[in-house]
């Protein structure tokens, strides 16, 4: 028998520095977690103690904090090289800055192979990107070799900016021939490493003949055997065992997100490459694990540029940006309009001639808007200003919901109106009229939504049975502020870009902004 230790991360999302327990900015260092310096300590400890170790990343290193905004992926290559990752799969967020924003900082600089079997380049890009990412890699480990096949969510064109010269194929269809090639090469230990979410990970384990282990990402799935060490609630045991169509037991793993845990899986193979046993658990990277001093020093060196960036002007406002709770928790506020407009703008993807865009709607809890921005400071808007408006380090995500769920959400928005509660929704691509004289749960009297399958966008009444795409904060997607119906009834959820980054990019693009209160939210006569 031959034993392999797989160390894995996924959805790190730019958390190079240690974070608080909820993966936001570290405040009390003695209680902070994660970060590449701490990760390195643990990885090195395991490498010294065990003979056959692979360190793998399942994608979405890009996007999530000011580190990515400033360094644009150079930080990912630099610190992953320093940690000596063995391989990485491409995630959807790796395309956030377009293909060039992937090629130059990461694909050309990474010292480890970057993988995806289901992304095919065409046209002029084919020769430019040739060899910079691969469908599979044969990694020598000790006296054996291990095959790694990569995959990426085929929804990436709707979630990021891969352009028109990359084709995202069905994962299972694309993986099978690559696994077959590895088998032909007499590589009999094969890991599928990828970024399509836990449901697809399980399908790959079930359907792709020859895959022995699946290491996934995208869905931020936390798996654990035993008593979990922090706040995350396990979606299942670690590893999660799938019985393949040909009768094999295939371990599937994921390690939550944000570098909070290091996935740790031990696999025992027989001489024919069959999995005899698999066990492990994610390791919580808490403050009991010291940060490696040399990596920490490097982080501090790179940090300097971030501090300078946060005070630079992004753009100007010529109007007061009303982000006060007195406005945003009671009525339409122009800060809410600005943020929603930025959220839609960030999701412009012309992937189908029938649609002007794939999504037109935004909802945003008024309680998530934490500060106004005064235009009387020469109109200057900085990252620092935006961090006061959106201090929680969330993301603006894409969900699919039925009209009936949206209706429930808008009823919830005003179910206890007048108490300055955070659930009052700011909107984009939506016209809502409330009648507060009616009883809670029956206050939405008009709800019109902007069409997507149209050449001239216009507002049509919401259809209860229709499925709509909506951009919203991850806080709402996870049922925050009492929006349990969103969490319970959503049909799809893909995590998006860092909230501040979305708004800052929009302001930089627009240069001068002047959002208005324009009648997106109305109250029918006699009730307000």
């Amino acid at each position: 028998a031959w034993e392999l230790t797989i160390l894995h991360t996924n959805d790190v999302h730019s958390r190079l520095e240690q974070t608080s327990e909820d993966s936001s900015k570290c405040v009390n260092a003695s209680r902070c977690m994660g970060g590449v310096a701490r990760l390195f300590t643990k990885v090195q400890q395991i490498r010294r103690a065990e003979p056959n170790v692979l360190l793998l990343d399942a994608g979405d290193q890009y996007q999530g904090t000011i580190w990515f905004t400033v360094y644009k992926g150079a930080e990912v290559a630099h610190f992953m090289n320093a940690l000596r990752y063995d391989a990485m799969a491409l995630g959807n967020h790796e395309f956030d800055n377009g293909v060039e924003g992937l090629i130059e900082p990461l694909l050309k600089e990474a010292k480890f192979p970057i993988l995806s079997a289901n992304i095919k380049a065409k046209g002029p890009l084919a020769s430019q990107i040739s060899g910079l990412y691969l469908p599979y890699k044969v990694l020598p480990v000790g006296d054996e070799v291990v095959g790694i096949v990569g995959y990426t969510s085929k929804e990436t064109p709707f979630l990021s900016n891969p352009g028109t010269n990359l084709v995202f194929e069905d994962e299972i269809t694309a993986l099978q021939p690559e696994v077959d090639k590895l088998k032909t090469l007499n590589v009999n230990k094969i890991i599928a490493l990828g970024h399509s979410g836990f449901e697809m990970d399980k399908l790959i384990a079930q359907k792709v003949r020859g895959v022995d282990v699946v290491v996934g990402g995208h869905s931020n799935t936390f798996l654990y055997t035993g008593n979990p060490p922090s706040k995350e609630v396990p979606a299942g045991k670690y590893p999660f065992i799938v019985t393949s169509d040909d009768g094999r037991k295939v371990p599937v793993v994921q390690a939550y997100a944000f570098g909070k845990y290091l996935g740790y899986l031990k696999i025992e193979f027989d001489e024919r490459g069959n999995v005899i046993s698999s066990h492990g658990n994610p390791i919580l990277l808490n403050s009991s694990i010291p940060e490696d001093p040399s990596i920490k020093a490097d982080i501090n060196k790179w940090r300097i540029k971030l501090d300078n960036y946060s005070t630079q002007e992004l753009g100007k406002t010529i109007v007061y940006l009303d982000g006060s709770s007195q406005s945003c928790r009671f009525r339409e506020c122009n800060m809410g309009n600005l943020i929603c407009d930025a959220m839609i703008n960030n999701n412009l993807r012309h992937t189908d001639e029938m649609f002007w865009n794939h999504v037109s709607m935004c909802i945003l809890n008024g309680g998530g808007i934490r500060s106004p921005i005064d235009e009387r400071n020469n109109g200057t808007i900085t990252w620092e200003n935006l961090a006061a408006v959106l201090p929680f380090g969330g993301t603006f995500d894409l969900v699919q919901l039925k009209g009936s769920t949206l209706k429930k959400a808008f009823e919830h928005s005003v179910h206890r109106y007048g108490q300055s509660t955070g659930e009052f929704l700011q909107v984009g691509g939506i016209h809502v009229v409330y009648d507060l004289s009616r009883k809670p749960g029956d206050r939405v009297v008009k709800l019109d939504v902007l069409c997507t399958k149209c050449r001239v966008p216009s507002y049509d009444p919401l259809k209860m049975d229709e499925v709509y795409k909506v951009i919203l904060p991850n806080f709402l997607a996870n049922g925050g502020d009492g929006f349990q119906m969103i969490k319970d009834e959503l049909l799809r959820h893909d995590s998006g870009d860092q909230d501040i980054n979305v708004v800052s990019t929009y302001i930089s693009k627009m240069k001068v902004i002047y959002p208005a209160v324009e009648g997106r939210i109305k109250f029918s006569t006699g009730s307000h």
């Epitope: 063995d86 990474a110 020598p140 032909t184 090469l185």
Partner: antibody, heavy 119, light 107 residues
């Protein structure tokens, strides 16, 4: 573009050792295997072994095990092939090569290094 | 070790001819076969890998086929620059081995 530049011709006495270098450029050295192949005068091609500069693991043709040593210097993007206990049978052109996809054919070759073993 | 036997060892042909070279493996190698062209004093050049995939920049007149133990390299219309020695190689089992070569000469 991918280039592999090998060291110059060598003349060695029987029993001696030779070390041939192969400097890679135009790609990330640590991400691809370097293969070594030799061709004796007027003969066919013979695979010696490979090294993966990403973690310095090696694999040898049993015929060369114990005599050939493959190493790499990642800071210089250079691979080396050392062959010891030379005999006249080792007179050959030695090539380094790189693939496009792991193992699947040698796509890029060095220009070759002629090693002559003669007393 | 897996032996690869190429036939013919020598082949005389004219410009424009269709040329077929075969490579027989002593045991099955699935499709783990590559084909190379070598000219005197030069390093080999990869033509085909995975038995039938043309390497970037290789003219479409070169094609490969076969699986298991029998493989063929076909040049659909021989050009003056195609006169060279051709080698097959298997990378399915260690040690990786080459055929003895087929020299294509001008008739």
């Amino acid at each position: 573009q991918v280039q592999l530049q090998q060291s110059g011709a060598e003349v060695k006495k029987p029993g001696a050792s030779v070390k041939v270098s192969c400097k890679a450029s135009g790609y990330t050295f640590t991400r691809y295997y370097i293969y070594w192949v030799r061709q004796r005068p007027g003969q066919g091609l013979e695979w010696i072994g490979w090294i993966y500069p990403g973690n310095f693991n090696t694999k040898y043709n049993e015929k060369f095990k114990g005599r050939a040593t493959l190493t790499a210097d990642t800071s210089a993007s250079t691979a080396y092939m050392e062959l010891s206990s030379l005999t006249s049978e080792d007179t050959a052109v030695y090539y380094c090569a790189r693939d496009v996809y792991d193992y699947a054919g040698f796509a890029y070759w060095g220009q070759g290094t002629l090693v002559t073993v003669s007393s | 070790d897996i032996q690869l036997t190429q036939s013919p060892s020598f082949l005389s042909a004219s410009v424009g001819d269709r040329v077929t070279i075969t490579c027989k493996a002593s045991q099955g190698v699935a499709t783990a076969v590559a084909w190379y062209q070598q000219k005197p004093g030069k390093a080999p050049k990869l033509l085909i890998y995975w038995a039938s995939t043309r390497h970037t920049g290789v003219p479409s007149r070169f094609s490969g086929s076969g699986s298991g133990t029998e493989f063929t390299l076909t040049i659909s219309s021989l050009q003056p620059e195609d006169f060279a020695t051709y080698y097959c190689q298997q990378y399915s089992s260690y040690p990786w081995t080459f055929g003895q070569g087929t020299k294509v000469e001008i008739k």
